[in-house]
Each structure stands twice: as C-alpha cells, then as structure tokens.
Interface confidence: low
C-alpha cells in the first residue's frame, strides 16, 4: 500500500505524459489524478512506465472504480491489462469487440492467461452466444480457442460461426467436443456442392455419424487417412469394406499402414476376410469364411 | 543482465539528418519499451522518444514530425531516424531499457551514449 503523501509543490501533473516517468511511486500516487488518468488512460500505453509504476497507475484506477472500470477505460488500458488479475476482470462488462481485439492484442503470442480467459469468458456471457465475429477473432488469437470449451459451452456456438472455424481450430478437440460441432457444421453448409462441401465438412467428421460416412461414400470424395483416422470408432464399424473403399478411393491402400491402430483395427475385426481380400492390400484378422457374424449390438437392444 | 550499444553518431549541418541505432544483447527477454534520451547538461536527462513492446511510440514535442523511433524485435535493435536536424538537438543521446523485472532502484538499463553534433 502506498502511504498518502502531499504532492511536492510543482510536481501536481497536468497531464499525462512522459515527465511522469521519472516520478517515484509515491510521487505518482500523490500527483497523479486518477480522474485525469482515466480520461487519458491512451497515452498511458505509449509512456514507458516500470512495471511498478503500472502498480500504482493500477492502484489509482482502482480507487477511482471499486466496482470495475468503464469500458471507456479497459479499451485503453494496454500493457496495464497484464497487471489485472482475473477478480478484477470478473468486475468488467466488456460489449465491444474492439475493446476485447485491444486487450487480446496486448498478450499476442503468449499462452492464454487466466486473466485472457477470465476476459473472453466476460465477453462471450455478455454477448450471450459465440457469434461469428467474436470466434473469427478468438481463432485469430488463440487458435486453439474452439478446443477448450467444453461441449455445453460449444452448444451455444450458432452454425453460422462455424464458416469462421478453420480446420487447425480443431486440432485439439476430442470426440465429444466434435460431436456437438458436427450437426452445426453440417447445417451451415448445407447448401454447398459435394467437393465443396466436403472440403469444408472434412474437418469436424470426427463428429459424423454412420449414416452421414455412408453417404459421403457415394460421393467421390476420396477421404485423406487422416481424415479416416480420426472418425469415431462406433461410426466406422458398421461401414462395408465396399463403403470404406469408395470414401478413401485411391487413399484406401494407407488402410495397410494404419491396420493396427483404431479405428481400422476393430473395423478390420468386424469384416469378412473375404471381403477384406478383395481389397488386394493383404489385411489380415477379419471374420474367418463360414463363420456366422452376430450384431451384438441388435443383440443387446432385444434383451 | 542486458547490455545496450548505440552507433550511428556524429557531426551533421543544420537541416541535415542522422540515423542512430542502439543494439541489445544478454537477457534480452526482460526488455520492455525502448527508448532515447538525451543529456544537454549533467544533470538534465530529457526523454526524446520512446516505443513500447507493442510499437506505440512517444515523442517530446520538440522533435515530434522530425524525427522517427523504430524498433526490430527480431534483432532486438531500436532506431532514431533524425531528420531536419537542429542546432539545439545537439546532445550526447542515451538508449534507455526498460527491465520488466525490475524491483530495485534502476527500472531502466542504459547504453554508453552516442554523441550527436548539429553545427549552424
């Protein structure tokens, strides 16, 4: 705590400027006026104020605002917004996107801090839904924003945003989040044409059910290995090996490279060996000729 | 620790223009905003410009609209483009640093200083 003490005679700041960085912090304290520091919180940024002096600029706004800053003065705060901690943001309402571009800007190239998150998760509660604009600059940021919300917080994504999404958004998503991200995907680009849909859909399929794999598979789309790898598993299984071929096309021969690993591994359990024959590529372990196949999963739905 | 050296000094006539440049080195991590200085007397050390981590910029009136701060964060290198130069700029300019760990009494380490000369 800095002790209140008479402003030297003279030293009484008339604004903000650059002769303030040679004031002590108790200087600061006792010439500075925070009125006058708020109303010109943007030349703040441009001053090249000690971090401990920041304390005190910090302190002065705090007095002046116990029940958190205006927006008026959070888009300028700049360098000032690292020294706030996570309860001061909970203190904020931040509606503009440029206020949140200011603030986002300032910790370019670091790792989300919890201040960022607190930040972003005034706004996004604010605003009620994630909308296009607000993920468009989220990515942009941090591109691996979409990943961290868990799937209940992804349902309020609207589909439209999803034509911000971009496919290493997704990186890091698991199957649940995927799963709540699919059907949006699916709805926001229903009107597309079937290279261009798939091109945009081919991302978020980590999410696709059996249904829409079979269908893409009348489609010519020639699905990378990647792609197929990252399918859910219960989707896969139940694809025909004359399915799986038509939606790898010439990709089908990586099957051979990835027959270990799931989802090709339980996928190659549940098929007939024969059929697995047919596709020339020598994969072994699936269901021995003259040998019956039970759906077990039909079987647990009747008992 | 950080160590500045500035180059680029020397003699010029009224009206002329001089760049000088000041290179960091050591534990360049902790810089902060960057900036020049300038020492008329001892015991008068006047901020000329200043730019910050995130390339805002700060000029004295004196020398706003002739001169340009720059900064290369790659090289970790910050600039004074000095045109229309005037006598009265005549000076020995200092590269200030700021340290963001700072906590004793020093927030700012500073270069050997390079002289700038402005004859009429």
């Known amino acids: 705590e800095v002790e209140k003490t008479a402003c030297p005679s003279g030293k009484k700041a008339r604004e903000i400027d650059e002769s303030l960085i040679f004031y002590k912090k108790w200087e600061l304290e006792a010439c500075v006026d925070a009125a006058l520091l708020a109303t010109q919180m943007d030349r703040v940024n441009a001053i090249p104020f000690t971090y401990e002096q920041l304390d005190v600029l910090k302190h002065k706004l705090d007095e002046l605002y116990p029940q958190g800053y205006p927006e008026s003065v959070i888009q300028h705060l700049g360098y000032l917004f690292l020294k706030m901690s996570p309860e001061d943001i909970r203190k904020w309402n931040v509606t503009s996107l440029e206020t949140l571009k200011a603030l986002l800007e300032v910790n370019k190239g670091h790792e989300m801090s919890p201040q960022v998150a607190t930040l972003i998760d005034r706004f996004v509660k604010g605003r009620g839904q994630l909308d296009k604009d607000t993920l468009d600059t989220l990515t942009a940021f941090y591109p691996g924003y979409l990943c961290s919300l868990s799937p209940e917080e992804l349902s309020s994504v609207p589909p439209s945003s999803i034509w911000a999404v971009r496919p290493q958004d997704l990186d890091t998503c698991d199957p649940r989040q995927l799963d709540v991200l699919y059907p949006k995907a699916r709805l926001a680009f229903q009107n597309m044409n079937g290279s261009e849909y798939f091109v945009k859909i081919q991302s978020f399929l980590g999410g696709a059910p059996t249904e829409d794999l079979k269908a893409l598979s009348q489609q010519n789309v020639s699905m990378d290995l990647a792609t197929f790898m990252k399918l859910r598993t219960d989707a896969v299984l139940p694809l025909t090996v004359a399915e799986v071929q038509k939606l790898l096309g010439p990709h089908v021969e990586g099957l051979k490279a990835e027959e270990r690993h799931r989802p090709v591994r339980d996928w190659i359990l549940r098929q007939r060996q024969d059929d697995l024959d047919t596709l020339g590529l020598g994969l072994q372990g699936g269901i021995p000729n003259g040998y019956l196949v039970l759906d077990l999963s039909m079987q647990e739905a009747l008992s | 620790e950080v160590q500045l050296v500035e180059s680029g000094g020397g003699s010029v006539q009224a009206g002329g223009s001089l760049k000088i440049s000041c290179a960091a080195s050591g534990s360049v991590i902790d810089i902060g905003a960057m900036g020049w200085y300038r020492h008329i007397t001892e015991k008068e050390r006047k901020l000329v410009a200043t730019?910050?981590?995130?390339?805002?910029?700060y000029y004295a009136d004196s020398v706003k609209g002739r001169f340009t701060i720059s900064r290369d964060n790659a090289k970790y290198t910050v600039y004074l483009q000095m045109n229309s130069l005037k006598p009265e700029d005549t000076a020995m300019y200092y590269c200030?640093?700021?340290?963001?760990?700072?906590?004793?009494?020093?927030?700012?380490?500073w270069g050997q200083g390079t002289q700038v000369t402005v004859s009429s």
């Open positions: 200030a640093a700021e340290d963001i760990n700072y906590t004793g009494t020093e927030a700012y380490y």
């Open positions: 730019i910050n981590a995130g390339g805002n910029t």
